[in-house]
Interface confidence: low
């Protein structure tokens, strides 16, 4: 299963199968992930050794039991892959590091005002992978506001040093963030020149451009198909790269196909794993396991729950079958590659489905780094848990924020309901940042059932807490995946960067916002609160924040969004914005449902028919 | 600040086409929508469609669909509105408009079309 | 398309006085109203806007009520700077749409 515990002051020992330099546990941890063999990590801040050779070392470890022996290293933080975690498995990385040079080949420096322009240069750049820019404060002045754009062989720097007034971070191109564009032709009897940066073993081309897409220098790619004239080379898929970005040639050859990575697409990138299953295909590797199965797709789940399986076989031969069930060959290699691939036989085969976002399991996400006052606008992917509910009578506007917390349920403010609650009006938009983009062509969740908290009652600030139950589920992308739930009974005070975020007002008697805003706000307590708000009962279930000089606050429009506090480099959903004596007003917090307070509740309504929790909050 | 710089006054005969620019600074370009909004002489005022220059979709007023295109350069924050098929009632001050939300707050100073045989 | 009527087309008012220009629509626009002033050969100036928000550089003399299909604004006392033609304009649906416009003039 999915585990996301972080061991602080601990390192596991031995299993090592790759190590690099990485900025934080977070980055090291992605890496893992993605690694075919990596279920265990360990990393090395800065702070935690002297040895300048292993500072910010992130090492990569495997297991047959899945599991090491964990030794006691004051600052060292280990943890699993996170692999079979669904969405939240991500390669986008948004963080800032500052203090921290990322060393590299440096093939592109020019002077730009700000560490998030650096950013953008290196995403809109395709060959650079990560970035340093020098501010303003630098000690040698010509090299002040320089932007160096980076790369290297594996896609991590090469060496990372402590300086001073210097920010690194990393293209965000595995966010889909990039403004290159990217081609999705795949362009069949054509091989494409240039340096090969890897060669594996894949059925189609469909499998090379996905491994292409995730590999760190791979911008195109040329597959050799099963009929291709010399034997050694079918299926061979070359990943390349050049100088200029793109093939300097390309070749007619019949029965190869050529295409580019997908890694420049904007909005939406493939998912780094592959779930096609090809009947009448051998799929040859590592031994990891043999089990009887009845069917190809149970095969396949079961590769997927084994978390070291890469691929399997499905046997049809009368000797692997007995009764309704055949053998399932679980596999593995080095590079998460079949070792060999033959045509023509009776098994059917494919590759686990660890990688996959669309997992169903907890909904944490750690990944990310009424208009708001005070706020900024916000960017695409930065809270994908955010939706628009908004209403179509005559014409159509945002009511309401909400907050997804699984495939098919939205945790939303009941108040946002008082006077509508047909549902068939409602119209639920979802990885969206500007309410500009919604056409009529944009598409939209209807609402299956709207569930009220029973204690609920129109005009009163109490139990303001609704569970939007969704038509239809939807899919996980870097634009749209849920909030992790607090566990029951939590503490806000361990909160200390909480961020509210919708399209309400930008002030009192404001309008509706275009572009999604944020703003940072700190958790008051409730003793404070009620001085505040001495006409009124602040409950226990109830979290405010605010600022004492006002300022910044949620307004009318983003009720029922989310407040959320990152805490251990995860986002949790702790409170729905609910009301509020004005927007901002000094000494006048904004009061929010606290949602711990109602976790059995939301699990209690979501469970599914089989008795199944649609989502659960974490361990 | 936020600015918004039309390109000069046209004349044009009927049946041609003419095409306006707007170059925008002050605010991130591709963040808010561009609207075009026409005022005939001692007439109204007209509201033709709009540009997100982030994504290139467009929103026009059917009244004008088939003869109005809104396009974006982002490398230089300009928009440009080409109306084709131009007829005499086409004449008219052109004006680009940047909501706030959802009414203009800013706008160009206007470019005069005069279609005159 | 949501039709606005603006009403009077035009009036003559001396400084001082109380001014009331209303704007009614074809069908219910839920507040998504805004006002403009608009002076010979110049652009519209956005005056005011949804539930009364009142646009930076305007004097709180202009103020803006109503709800529904009827809308309406006033200008508490007329100064010489406020002759101008002023417009409605709907933005609760697209095609947005404009009043025909009041010109206020001096009497």
């Known amino acids: 299963g999915c585990l996301t515990q972080l061991y602080e002051n601990a390192f596991f020992r031995g299993g090592d199968v790759a190590s690099m330099y990485t900025p934080n546990a977070q980055y090291c941890q992605m890496r893992c992930t993605f690694h075919p063999r990596c279920l265990l990590f360990s990393f090395l801040p800065a702070s935690s050794i002297n040895d300048m050779e292993k500072r910010f070392g992130c090492f990569l470890k495997d297991s047959v039991t899945g599991t090491l022996p964990k030794v006691h290293r004051t600052g060292a933080v280990s943890g699993h892959s996170l692999k079979q975690c669904g969405h939240q498995i991500s390669a986008c990385h948004r963080d800032i590091y500052k203090g921290v040079d990322m060393r590299g080949v440096n093939f592109n420096v020019s002077k730009v005002s700000s560490v998030e322009e650096c950013q953008k240069r290196c995403t809109s750049n395709i060959r650079c992978q990560f970035f340093s820019y020098a501010t303003q404060t630098f000690h040698k002045a010509e090299y002040r506001n320089n932007c160096l754009l980076k790369y290297s062989p594996g896609g991590t720097p090469t060496a990372i040093k402590v300086l001073s007034n210097v920010e690194s971070g990393f293209s965000l191109k595995p966010c889909a963030l990039s403004e290159i564009g990217c081609h999705m032709n795949i362009f069949q009897h054509l091989a494409f020149s240039d340096v090969d940066v890897a060669r594996v073993l894949t059925p189609d081309a469909f499998v090379c451009r996905t491994i292409c897409t995730y590999h760190p220098n791979c911008l195109f790619f040329t597959f050799y198909t099963n009929v291709w004239k010399i034997e050694s080379q079918r299926n061979v898929c070359l990943l390349k790269t050049s100088e200029s970005g793109t093939p300097s040639s390309s070749t007619p050859q019949e029965n190869t196909i050529s295409g580019y990575s997908l890694l420049t697409c904007k909005r939406t990138l493939p998912e780094p794993c592959h779930s096609k299953i090809y009947p009448g295909v051998d799929f040859g590797g590592e031994e990891l396991n043999v089990t009887f199965v009845k069917g190809v797709n149970v095969c396949q789940e079961t590769c997927t729950k084994m978390i070291r399986c890469q691929f399997f076989t499905y046997s049809l031969l009368p000797e692997d079958c007995k009764e309704e069930k055949c053998k399932c060959f679980l596999r593995l290699s080095m590079d998460g590659s079949p070792t060999r691939i033959a045509y023509g036989t009776q098994g059917s085969s494919g590759y686990s489905l660890r990688l996959c976002n669309t997992g169903d399991n907890s909904v944490c996400t750690t990944k990310t780094s009424t208009r708001i006052v005070g706020g900024t606008n916000s960017s695409w992917g930065e809270w994908p848990w955010q939706v628009s509910l908004q209403v179509k009578l005559t014409a159509q506007r945002h009511l309401c924020g909400g907050s997804l917390i699984g495939h098919q349920w939205v945790l939303t403010a009941a108040h946002c309901f008082d006077g509508l609650p047909l549902q068939d009006v409602w119209r639920i938009y979802s990885g969206i940042l500007n309410l500009s983009d919604i056409t009529k062509d944009t598409p939209f969740s209807q609402i299956k059932e709207i569930i009220i908290h029973q204690n609920y009652k129109v005009s009163e600030g109490n139990h303001d807490i609704a569970l939007i139950k969704l038509q239809a589920p939807l899919n996980y992308t870097e634009f749209q995946k849920p909030i992790c739930l607090p566990s029951k009974g939590d503490t806000s005070t361990i909160y200390t960067n909480c961020w509210v975020t919708g399209w309400g007002f930008s002030k009192e008697k404001g309008e509706i916002q275009n572009i999604l805003q944020k703003v940072n706000i700190p958790l008051v307590t409730n003793e404070e609160c009620q001085k505040r708000y001495q006409d009124y009962k602040i409950t226990q279930r109830m979290v405010c924040a605010g600022y004492k000089e006002g300022g910044k606050d949620a307004c009318k429009g983003d009720s029922g969004g989310p407040l959320v506090c990152k805490h251990n480099g995860m986002w949790r959903l702790v409170g729905i914005t609910s009301w509020g004596e004005g927007c901002a007003r000094r000494e006048q917090p904004g009061v929010y449902t606290k949602v711990a307070e109602y976790m059995d509740w939301i699990l209690e309504k979501t469970q599914s028919s089989d008795g199944k929790a649609q989502m659960q909050s974490p361990a | 600040q936020v600015q918004l710089v039309q390109s000069g006054a046209e004349v044009k005969k009927p049946g041609a086409s003419v095409k306006v620019s707007c170059k925008a600074s002050?605010?991130?370009?591709?963040?808010?929508?561009m609207h075009w909004v026409r005022q005939a002489p001692g007439q109204g005022l007209e509201w033709m469609g709009a540009?997100?220059?982030?994504?290139?979709?467009?929103a026009y007023n059917q009244k004008f669909k088939g003869r109005v295109t809104m396009t974006r350069d982002t490398s230089t924050s300009t928009v440009y509105m080409e109306l084709s098929s131009l007829r005499s009632e086409d004449t008219a001050v052109y004006y680009c408009?940047?909501?706030?939300?959802?009414?203009?707050?800013?706008w160009g100073q206007g470019t005069l079309v005069t279609v005159s045989s | 398309d949501i039709q606005m009527t603006q009403s009077p087309s035009s009036l003559s008012a001396s400084v001082g006085e109380r001014v009331t220009i209303t704007c009614k629509a074809s069908e219910d626009i839920y507040n998504r109203l805004a006002w403009y002033q608009q002076k010979p050969g110049k652009a519209p100036k956005l005056l005011l806007y949804?539930?009364?928000g009142l646009e930076a550089g305007f004097h709180l003399r202009f103020s803006g009520s109503g709800s529904g299909t009827h809308y309406t604004l006033t200008i508490a006392s007329l100064q010489p700077e406020d002759f101008a033609t002023y417009y409605c304009?709907?933005?609760?649906?697209?095609?947005?749409?404009f009043g025909q416009g009041t010109k206020v003039e001096i009497k």
């Open positions: 304009q709907q933005y609760w649906s697209t095609p947005w749409t």
């Open positions: 002050g605010y991130t370009f591709t963040d808010y929508e």
């Open positions: 540009i997100h220059p982030g994504s290139g979709g467009t």
């Open positions: 949804g539930e009364t």
């Open positions: 408009a940047r909501p706030y939300g959802y009414p203009f707050a800013y």
